[in-house]
Interface confidence: low
C-alpha cells in the first residue's frame, strides 16, 4: 500500500512530505485571517470570504477552484423589532426584560454585524403564559414530566438547558407536548466549568454569553424549501407552510443571568432528583408558574425574526487525480459563523487551508495524487447542513459512482486533551496505522505516538490497548455523504477530558466570545494541537487519495455489525413475553451477520494476493471497498426520515448528534410499551429485523468473488 | 465616531502624478478593506479599487479604467490608506471618495482635476 | 462588468409623498444590492445595505426589497431633508458598479 506507488513519483514525494509541509505557524494566521469579522450565512463578508478563498486555493496550486451557489431558506433577527423575552404583571407591564445582545469582547466594541443571539427557524410570535421548567428537554424528561409528576405542558413557555442533545430535538419534544414556546438557556452546570474564569480571562461562559444554534428537525433534508433536490436556479419551492423541519412555536435563546431572573421565581413541583438541578442559585422547581408574590406574573415572548430565501456560496477545489481521476476522496469544512469563529468552524477551516496549501506545494512540484481530492468550504451548515447538502443533492450521480470517502473539517478543538475520531469502521485500520506515526503533541508524551497517548487517555470500552472510535452521528456536513449517500465517511478533532469536564460542548461555543484569542490564550497557544489534527485529516485524505488498494478493512464491519446484532437483541428481550407472543426472531439478522463475517474474512485473504499489477482487477476490488459502504443504503430510507438511508448507522431520534446502530429497528423498539396497537408496533419491529438482515446479507454479497 | 478624512486632491497636468491620503479615526483601521470611489461633476459613482488588510495579505483590485495606472497602498501605523494616481488623463477629473468596507462610511472627498 | 440600471432618473414630489425608485442588474447579484443617499456637495450616505436592512441611525421610512436582478428603494411619508440623489450599488463581484442616480425634486 505504500503512497509512492501510485503515480510514478520520486520517493520524496510520500505521506512523510506531505505532512512536513504543515505548519503551525501557518494555521495559527489562517486563523487570525478567518477571525476578524463575522462571515454568518448570507451576508456580504462571508460571499467575500469564499472569494478570497477560491483566490487562495487558487495560488496554492488546486486545478480548478468554483464557487457553488444555491439560493435556500435563511432565519435572520429583523434588526427593527429585537427579539426578546419579558416578565410581565397583572397590568401587562414589562418589569424584567431579557438582553438584547451579549457584551461585546474586548478589542470587539466596534465591529459591526454581530447577529444577537437568536434561535434560527424560529416562527415570529408573542406568546405569553406560564412557565414550567424541563430539565434538559430530553425525551426521558419529558416523560418524567408527564408520566411520573403528571405535569401538562399543554399552552405553557417551556425553559429548558441547553446541553446533552441538539436543540433542535428540545424544541421537537416541547411541541409534541403542547408547549407554546421554548426558552433555551446555558445553566453554568454545563458551560462553566469549576476553577476557570470566564472570558476574557478563561474559556468559561460569561453571563451574558449565550449560545446561538439552528432549531430545525430536518432529518437530512438540506434545504427546507427543496427537499431531495438543489435550490438551484430553477428550483420550485415548497410554501413555507409545507417546508421540511421548521419550528411551530417560538423559541429563544438567553444566558444564565436572565435565566437566573426567570427562574429565581419559579413555584409549583420540586425538581424530582438532583439531575434536574443545575448550579444557579435557584430552586430549580419545576411550576407551572411562579411561586406565591409572583403567582400572577407572567412570561412573555417577543419574537420577530424572518425567514428569507437568500443565496449562499460553497467554494469547490479539484486536484486532478493522475491514475483515477474518476475516484474522488473529499475534504470538507464550513465557512460560515454565527459570529467570529473562532471554534466553530474557522479552527477547522483554517487547518483546511493549510492542508490544500501543503498538498498545492507537492503538485507544484510535479506531484499528484492517484485519485481526485475535491475540498470544500461549505456554506450556512450554522442553519442545517445547507450547503454540503445541497451540493451533494445536485452531484448525487457522480458522488454515487465516485465517491470514495469524504473526510470532515470541522472545529478542529473542542479542547486539548486527547484526540477524538468518529467514523466508519472502514477507517478503523486507517487510523489506528496513521496515528502511529504521528508524534503526539500532549504533555508528558514527548517522544511517543499519537495512538499512544489517545489510547492511554480515551480507551476503547471494548478493546484493550487500542483507542475509542465513536459511531458518526449528524449535527455536520458528512451527514449527506454518509447517512444519504453511503460514502464512507470520518472525523477527527482534539476534545477535553470526558472523565472530568462533564460540561457539554465547550462553554463559549457559539456566543459573541469564540474568538481567536479564545484559541490563542486559552486553548493551544502553541497551534500543536491543531497541527495534529492537520496531519490526522490530511494524513487520512492522502491515504485515502494515494494508496494503490484502498485503506478500507471491511472485517472491521463484521465486528461491530456483530456488536450492533448483540446490543438490539438485548434491548429487544427485555420484551420477553411479547416476542414470543408476537414470534419475533433475530435469527436472520444473526445469520446475515455471520455471512458477513465469513465472506469479509475471504475476501482480506484475496486482497493479500491478487496481482495488483492488473489494473482492471485492481479496479475490482478497489471498487467493491469503496461500494461497500453504499451498500448499506436503503432507497427508500428509514420511516418518516427518507433522507436516512444508511440501515446501520443513522443520527439518533431523540439526538440529533449521537450515532444509533440498526436504527430501524431501535426505534421500532423504543418506548414499545406504551404503543396503542402493540400487534401493529411488534409487526413493525419485525418488518426492521426484516430490512436489516436483507441489507447486511446483501453488502456481504457485494464483497464475493464476482465469479 | 468614524471619520475618513481624505487629502491630497489638486490641479494636475495630463501624465502627472498625485498621491491622495485617507486618514481614519473612531475603528480599528487595521482590521477593514478600504475603498477609493470617485464622482466626476454632475455624474455618477464610480469605484476605483480597494485594499484589504494584513490578514488578507494587502490585496488590492481595481476597475478596469485605472488598472496599471492607480496603486491603493495603506499604512496602518497611521491609519492612513493612499491613492497613488499616475499617467493621469482628463477623464480622471472627479471628487475622489475613500470609504470603509462596504461603503458604509465614507469621507468628505477631494477634488483632483487633470487639466492641461 | 453588471451594469445597474435605475430608474427613474429623476423624480418629482411633495412632502409626504412616498416614492419608489427602481434599479435593475445586468445579473444576478443575490441580495448584494446597497443603496445610497447624495445631497449636493456632500459625500453618499449609506441607506440600505444586503437589498433590505437599514444601516445604523437610517430612518425607517426608508425600505429597501428584492434579490436577483430587480431591487426597489420606497421613501414612506416623504421629508424635506430626503430630497436628494440616490444611487444603487452592488458589490457582488469585481468590479463594483453603481447605477447611474435618481434625483428626488421638489414638486
Known amino acids: 500500500k505504500s503512497s509512492n506507488e501510485a503515480t510514478n513519483i520520486t520517493p520524496k514525494h510520500n505521506m512523510k512530505a506531505f505532512l512536513d509541509e504543515l505548519k503551525a505557524e501557518n494555521i495559527k494566521k489562517f486563523l487570525y485571517n478567518f477571525t476578524q469579522i463575522p462571515h454568518l450565512a448570507g451576508t456580504e463578508q462571508n460571499f467575500q470570504l469564499a472569494k478570497q478563498i477560491q483566490s487562495q486555493w487558487k495560488e496554492f496550486g488546486l486545478d480548478s477552484v468554483e464557487l457553488a451557489h444555491y439560493d435556500v431558506l435563511l432565519s435572520y433577527p429583523n434588526k427593527t423589532h429585537p427579539n426578546y423575552i419579558s416578565i410581565i404583571n397583572e397590568d401587562g407591564n414589562e418589569i424584567f426584560n431579557t438582553s438584547l445582545f451579549e457584551p461585546p469582547p474586548p478589542g470587539y466594541e466596534n465591529v459591526s454585524d454581530i447577529v444577537p443571539p437568536f434561535s434560527a427557524f424560529s416562527p415570529q410570535g408573542m406568546p405569553e403564559g406560564d412557565l414550567v421548567y424541563v430539565n434538559y428537554a430530553r425525551t426521558e424528561d419529558f416523560f418524567k414530566l408527564e408520566r411520573d409528576m403528571k405535569i401538562n405542558c399543554s399552552g405553557k413557555i417551556v425553559i429548558a438547558r441547553y446541553g446533552k442533545v441538539f436543540r433542535g430535538n428540545k424544541v421537537k419534544n416541547a411541541q409534541l407536548a403542547g408547549a407554546k414556546g421554548v426558552i433555551l438557556y446555558s445553566d453554568p452546570a454545563d458551560y462553566f466549568a469549576p476553577g476557570v474564569k470566564s472570558y476574557p480571562d478563561g474559556w468559561n461562559l460569561p453571563g451574558g454569553g449565550v449560545q446561538r444554534g439552528n432549531i430545525l428537525n430536518l432529518n437530512g433534508a438540506g434545504d427546507p424549501l427543496t427537499p431531495g433536490y438543489p435550490a438551484n436556479e430553477y428550483a420550485y419551492r415548497r410554501g413555507i407552510a409545507e417546508a421540511v423541519g421548521l419550528p411551530s412555536i417560538p423559541v429563544h435563546p438567553i444566558g444564565y443571568y436572565d435565566a437566573q431572573k426567570l427562574l429565581e421565581k419559579m413555584g409549583g413541583s420540586a425538581p424530582p432528583d438532583s439531575s434536574w438541578r443545575g448550579s444557579l442559585k435557584v430552586p430549580y422547581n419545576v411550576g407551572p408558574g411562579f411561586t406565591g408574590n409572583f403567582s400572577t406574573q407572567k412570561v412573555k415572548m417577543h419574537i420577530h425574526s424572518t425567514n428569507e430565501v437568500t443565496r449562499i456560496y460553497n467554494v469547490i477545489g479539484t486536484l486532478r487525480g493522475a491514475v483515477e481521476p474518476d475516484r474522488y476522496v473529499i475534504l470538507g469544512g464550513h465557512r460560515d459563523s454565527w459570529v467570529f469563529g473562532g471554534i466553530d468552524p474557522q479552527s477547522g477551516a483554517a487547518v483546511v487551508h493549510e492542508i490544500v496549501r501543503s498538498f498545492g506545494t507537492l503538485k507544484k512540484e510535479g506531484w499528484r495524487p492517484r485519485r481526485t481530492i475535491l475540498f470544500a468550504s461549505w456554506d450556512a451548515e450554522e442553519f442545517g447542513l445547507l450547503g454540503s447538502t445541497e451540493w451533494a443533492e445536485e452531484n448525487s450521480r457522480l458522488l454515487q459512482e465516485r465517491g470514495v470517502a469524504y473526510i470532515n473539517a470541522d472545529s478542529s478543538i473542542e479542547g486539548n486533551y486527547t484526540l477524538r475520531v468518529d467514523c466508519t469502521p472502514l477507517m478503523y485500520s486507517l487510523v489506528h496505522n496513521l496515528t502511529k506515526e504521528l508524534k503526539s503533541p500532549d504533555e508528558g508524551f514527548e517522544g511517543k505516538s499519537l495512538y499512544e497517548s489517545w489510547t492511554k487517555k480515551s480507551p476503547s470500552p471494548e478493546f484493550s490497548g487500542m483507542p475509542r472510535i465513536s459511531k458518526l452521528g449528524s449535527g455536520n456536513d458528512f451527514e449527506v455523504f454518509f447517512q444519504r449517500l453511503g460514502i464512507a465517511s470520518g472525523r477527527a478533532r482534539y476534545t477535553k477530558n470526558w472523565e472530568t469536564n462533564k460540561f457539554s460542548g465547550y462553554p463559549l461555543y457559539h456566543s459573541v466570545y469564540e474568538t481567536y484569542e479564545l484559541v490563542e490564550k486559552f486553548y493551544d497557544p502553541m497551534f500543536k494541537y491543531h497541527l495534529t489534527v492537520a496531519q490526522v485529516r490530511g494524513g487520512m485524505v492522502f491515504e485515502l487519495a494515494n494508496s494503490i488498494v484502498l485503506p478500507f478493512d471491511c472485517r472491521d464491519y463484521a465486528v461491530v455489525l456483530r456488536k450492533y446484532a448483540d446490543k438490539i437483541y438485548s434491548i429487544s428481550m427485555k420484551h420477553p413475553q411479547e416476542m414470543k407472543t408476537y414470534s419475533v426472531s433475530f435469527d436472520s439478522l444473526f445469520s446475515a451477520v455471520k455471512n458477513f463475517t465469513e465472506i469479509a474474512s475471504k475476501f482480506s485473504e484475496r486482497l493479500q494476493d491478487f496481482d495488483k499489477s492488473n489494473p482492471i482487477v485492481l479496479r475490482m476490488m478497489n471498487d467493491q471497498l469503496m461500494f461497500l459502504e453504499r451498500a448499506f443504503i436503503d432507497p427508500l430510507g428509514l420511516p418518516d426520515r427518507p433522507f436516512y438511508r444508511h440501515v446501520i448507522y443513522a443520527p439518533s431520534s431523540h439526538n440529533k448528534y449521537a450515532g444509533e446502530s440498526f436504527p430501524g429497528i431501535y426505534d421500532a423498539l423504543f418506548d414499545i410499551e406504551s404503543k396503542v396497537d402493540p400487534s401493529k408496533a411488534w409487526g413493525e419491529v419485525k418488518r426492521q429485523i426484516y430490512v436489516a438482515a436483507f441489507t447486511v446479507q446483501a453488502a456481504a454479497e457485494t464483497l464475493s468473488e464476482v465469479a | 465616531e468614524v471619520q475618513l478624512v481624505e487629502s491630497g486632491g489638486g490641479l494636475v497636468q495630463p501624465g502627472g502624478s498625485l498621491k491622495l491620503s485617507c486618514a481614519a479615526s473612531?475603528?480599528?483601521?487595521?482590521?477593514?478593506?478600504m475603498n477609493w470611489v470617485r464622482q466626476a461633476s454632475g455624474k455618477g459613482l464610480e469605484w476605483v479599487g480597494e485594499?484589504?488588510?494584513?490578514?488578507?495579505?494587502?490585496?488590492?483590485h481595481y476597475a478596469e479604467s485605472v488598472k496599471g495606472r492607480f496603486t491603493i497602498s495603506r499604512d496602518d501605523s497611521k491609519n492612513t490608506a493612499y491613492l497613488q494616481m499616475n499617467s493621469l488623463k482628463t477623464e480622471d477629473t472627479a471628487v475622489y471618495y475613500c470609504?470603509?468596507?462596504?461603503?458604509?462610511?465614507w469621507g468628505q472627498g477631494t477634488t483632483v482635476t487633470v487639466s492641461s | 462588468d453588471i451594469q445597474m440600471t435605475q430608474s427613474p432618473s429623476s423624480v418629482s414630489a411633495s412632502v409626504g409623498d412616498r416614492v419608489t425608485i427602481t434599479c435593475k442588474a445586468s445579473e444576478n447579484v443575490g441580495t448584494y444590492v446597497s443603496w445610497y443617499q447624495q445631497k449636493p456637495g456632500t459625500a453618499p450616505k449609506l441607506l440600505i445595505y444586503g437589498a433590505s436592512n437599514r444601516f445604523t441611525g437610517v430612518p425607517s421610512r426608508f425600505s429597501g426589497s428584492g434579490s436577483a436582478t430587480d431591487f426597489t428603494l420606497t421613501i414612506n411619508n416623504l421629508q424635506p431633508e430626503d430630497f436628494a440623489t440616490y444611487y444603487c450599488g452592488q458589490s457582488y463581484t469585481f468590479p463594483y458598479t453603481f447605477g447611474q442616480g435618481t434625483k428626488v425634486e421638489i414638486k
Open positions: 485594499i484589504r488588510s494584513q490578514s488578507n495579505n494587502f490585496a488590492t
Open positions: 470609504t470603509r468596507r462596504w461603503n458604509n462610511f
Open positions: 473612531g475603528f480599528t483601521f487595521s482590521n477593514y478593506w
